[in-house]
């Protein structure tokens, strides 16, 4: 932004500048250019020997300026365009200035003036241009400063040129008031802080409803000596509930929200929220809908799922496979997990209790993502009730639970009672028994054995009787032995694992039971 202190051309000849010597040299004249009257100060004493003609401006109030710019528009005639070349003719003039705190009026003293520069034209007006009225306009600019007094004068010294001053414009530069990145920067006088620091750092203030982002830098700009803003640093962002519209922050419209200071616009309230008011930072959930703590505010409100569908319990001897399908209503969430709980009841007494400790699940039962699980180590002659609960991220926000139950009765055999009948260095004779009432249901017995400490291999023998001799064993070696009844329904309960040791080659009649 240029703040003009003096503009000769704009004054249409009304500025009465001082000429010295009076009535000679510089002269105010009017001409017609492009059918418009223009005014100029002109001098053309090119054949009268040495010249020293001065033209002084009126006193100019400095205002806030420290450095001023002087723009001159002028024309200079070619000395060769005059007959005989006009021997004393010059093609330059001198520019001066003087500072003062008061207007000296018509009291003009050359010694008070300091030379700024010799002003020379880039283009001179030759005869053909002059005759054709082609004004060869030169534009020269000079900077003066720092200024310290209340005002100043400019003066133009003619030393024998044929020159016309068409425009004298004096101005200083300001960086204009500016909005940048939602920050307002004040109008700032363009001034170099020092020779090494040609930029003035100016702090901006965030516009209404804008803030400096958390941990970010406040807005800064640099005002150059040329009155231009450079290098923005930092920024402001529209605060929560407001969005950027051009250079301002506007409250979110009803039905929209913005939860944090950011560059993003207000978002439409998501599904299952109540309509927000103007300037909302969030949208409340409808009744029965919730937000998990980790849910972004832009996400729809959700609710707990309904119970799993079609829970089935398939008994397989001492095992049960539980299968179910996903809930019909997921509550609008993908983060569904299932929990399985187990209750056992003794048929004789009707007594019931939890059975998590005595059964074994094929995978941990409390954050299942699959829709099936196998439960083993079930006791015979026991009624089991399994509950499968569907949960999602908002289930913890309500007291009600969504589950489905399935019951199963375990009618499998009791585990066989196993003992060591005999042993040698290379064999073990094992016998077992089960209650007579259950014997009819047993199809065969499965004997599993392996060396203790050897998890990689085991042997299986099947028999219809109640005993088996395990041959080809290693002397003086402990074996792990388990017997399990096989029924039409599948595997029955297995015995506990027994440790039996073969005799050493030295021989001993002692038996380990």
């Amino acid at each position: 932004k240029e703040v003009v202190l003096l503009d000769f051309a704009a004054m249409k000849g009304e500025l009465g500048w001082l000429t010295h010597p009076y009535g000679k040299g510089w002269d105010l004249m009017q001409n017609i250019m492009d059918d418009m009257p223009i005014y100029m100060y002109s001098v053309c004493n090119v054949v009268s020997g040495d010249q020293d003609n001065w033209l002084r401006t009126n006193w100019v109030y400095r205002e806030e300026a420290e450095r001023i710019f002087i723009e001159l528009k002028f024309t200079v005639r070619d000395c060769n365009s005059f007959p005989g070349g006009a021997s004393s003719c010059k093609e330059t003039f001198n520019l001066y200035y003087a500072e003062s705190d008061v207007d000296y009026g018509t009291n003009f003293q050359k010694r008070q003036f300091t030379k700024i520069d010799t002003i020379a034209p880039d283009e001179i007006t030759v005869s053909s241009d002059f005759e054709a009225r082609n004004v060869k306009l030169n534009v020269e600019e000079r900077m003066v400063g720092p200024l310290t007094r209340k005002g100043f004068y400019l003066a133009f010294q003619d030393i024998g040129a044929c020159v016309a001053l068409l425009s004298v414009r004096v101005y200083y530069k300001k960086c204009p008031e500016m909005l940048q990145s939602l920050a307002r920067f004040p109008e700032t006088i363009a001034v170099a802080v020092s020779d090494t620091q040609p930029l003035a750092t100016v702090a901006g203030t965030c516009v209404d409803h804008a803030v400096v982002p958390y941990g970010g830098e406040g807005p800064l700009m640099h005002c150059t000596v040329d009155g231009e803003w450079l290098v923005p640093i930092g920024q402001c962002l529209c605060q929560e509930g407001y969005e950027k519209v051009e250079d301002a922050c506007r409250a979110c419209s009803p039905g929209f929200f913005k939860s944090e200071a950011s560059e993003s616009p207000c978002l439409e309230c998501p599904e299952h929220t109540l309509p927000s008011t103007e300037g909302a930072t969030s949208c409340q959930c409808e009744e029965g809908y919730f937000r998990a703590p980790e849910d972004p505010l832009s996400m729809s409100c959700t609710r707990p799922p309904s119970a799993p569908n079609y829970l089935t319990a398939i008994g397989m001897g001492a095992k049960v496979e539980l299968r179910w399908t996903a809930p019909k209503d997921t509550g609008g969430r993908q983060d569904i997990v299932y929990s399985v709980t187990c209750e056992q009841c003794w048929p004789e007494s009707g007594e019931c209790g939890p059975c998590e400790a005595s059964v074994r699940y094929s995978e941990p039962p409390h954050a299942l993502t699959r829709t099936s699980v196998t439960v083993s180590d079930l006791e015979p002659h026991m009624n089991y009730t399994f509950a499968v609960e569907a949960r999602n991220g908002v289930s913890g926000l309500v007291t009600s639970r969504s589950f489905r139950t399935a019951s199963v009765s375990i009618n499998q055999t009791e585990p066989p009672k196993v003992r060591l009948e005999d042993r040698s260095t290379t064999s073990l004779s094992v016998t077992w028994s089960i209650p007579v009432s259950q014997q009819s249901r047993v199809w065969k017995y499965e004997v599993t054995y392996r060396k203790k400490g050897d998890a990689n291999s085991y042997n299986v023998r099947r028999t219809e009787g109640f005993s088996v001799t395990l041959d080809d064993l290693a002397p003086d070696t402990t074996y792990l032995v388990q017997v399990q009844a096989l029924t039409q329904e599948g595997q029955g309960a297995g015995s506990k694992v027994h440790e039996f040791q073969t005799l050493s080659t030295e021989g001993s009649a002692n038996m380990a039971v």
């Epitope: 002269d27 004249m29 009017q30 001409n31 017609i32 009257p37 100029m40 002109s42 001098v43 053309c44 004493n45 090119v46 054949v47 024309t75 200079v76 005639r77 365009s81 005059f82 007959p83 007006t125 005869s127 053909s128 002059f130 005759e131 054709a132 009225r133 004004v135 044929c162 020159v163 016309a164 068409l166």
Partner: antibody, heavy 128, light 107 residues
Framework: EVQLLESGGGLVQPGGSLRLSCAAS????????MAWVRQAPGKGLEWVSR????????HYADSVKGRFTISRDNSKNTLYLQMNSLRAEDTAVYYC?????????????????????WGQGTLVTVSS | DIQMTQSPSSLSASVGDRVTITCRAS??????LAWYQQKPGKAPKLLIY???NLHTGVPSRFSGSGSGTEFSLTISGLQPDDFATYYC?????????FGQGTKVEIK
């Protein structure tokens, strides 16, 4: 010394035509703006037309526009005025006049010109 | 067009007198004004251009002044050779116009 010598004047009937010439010497003709100025008997001076050093631009007084044509031949150092559709009010002494910007000690040329050098004139009489 | 009005249209003066002739323009012409001298049966001669600039070879007793619409030609000490008719001419417009003339006669 600058010399301008007009010729071609004489008696002509209304509606007739005449061509005036102005022979120049003693200066560089091609540098000068040239003009015709007339003076009716016992009256003041009236500017008629002008032509630039290279043959343009040309300007005419309203009273002669469309009837008179100014021209020049720089190779012959001669200025011309072709006068057609002559009227009684065109009766006057016709002067050829010149202007050299080199002798105009001003920084910016005036909107038009004045006349530094004049010929002795030639009389044109339009009468039936 | 700009009208130029001279006054007086004629005047009688003696040798040595100071004589002033005025010229008024119908609108401002800045200083774009010339003065000419014409003797009977002769061509006009340029005296002054740009209101106050003396043409080469013109005696210094002739001077011009004024700007805008009011101009004057002054002969500071009238000489026998100065008895003639004087014309002003504006050249602020392409339709250059002359005043009607002022005749300076011997008293």
């Amino acid at each position: 010394e600058v010399q301008l010598l007009e010729s071609g004047g004489g008696l002509v009937q209304p509606g007739g035509s005449l061509r005036l010439s102005c022979a120049a010497s003693g200066f560089t003709f091609s540098h000068y703006m040239m003009a015709w100025v007339r003076q009716a008997p016992g009256k003041g001076l009236e500017w008629v037309s002008r032509i630039g050093p290279s043959g343009g631009p040309t300007h005419y007084a309203d009273s002669v526009k469309g009837r008179f044509t100014i021209s020049r031949d720089n190779s012959k150092n001669t200025l011309y005025l072709q006068m057609n559709s002559l009227r009684a009010e065109d009766t006057a002494v016709y002067y050829c006049a010149g202007y050299d910007s080199g002798y105009d000690y001003v920084a910016v040329a005036g909107p038009a010109e004045y006349f530094q050098h004049w010929g002795q004139g030639t009389l044109v009489t339009v009468s039936s | 067009d700009i009208q130029m009005t001279q006054s007086p249209s004629s005047l009688s003066a003696s040798v040595g007198d100071r004589v002033t002739i005025t010229c008024r323009a119908s609108q401002s012409i800045s200083t774009w004004l010339a003065w000419y001298q014409q003797k009977p049966g002769k061509a006009p001669k340029l005296l002054i251009y740009k209101a106050s600039n003396l043409h080469t070879g013109v005696p210094s007793r002739f001077s011009g002044s004024g700007s805008g619409t009011e101009f004057s030609l002054t002969i500071s000490g009238l000489q026998p050779d100065d008895f003639a008719t004087y014309y002003c001419q504006q050249y602020n417009q392409y339709s250059r116009t002359f005043g009607q003339g002022t005749k300076v006669e011997i008293k």
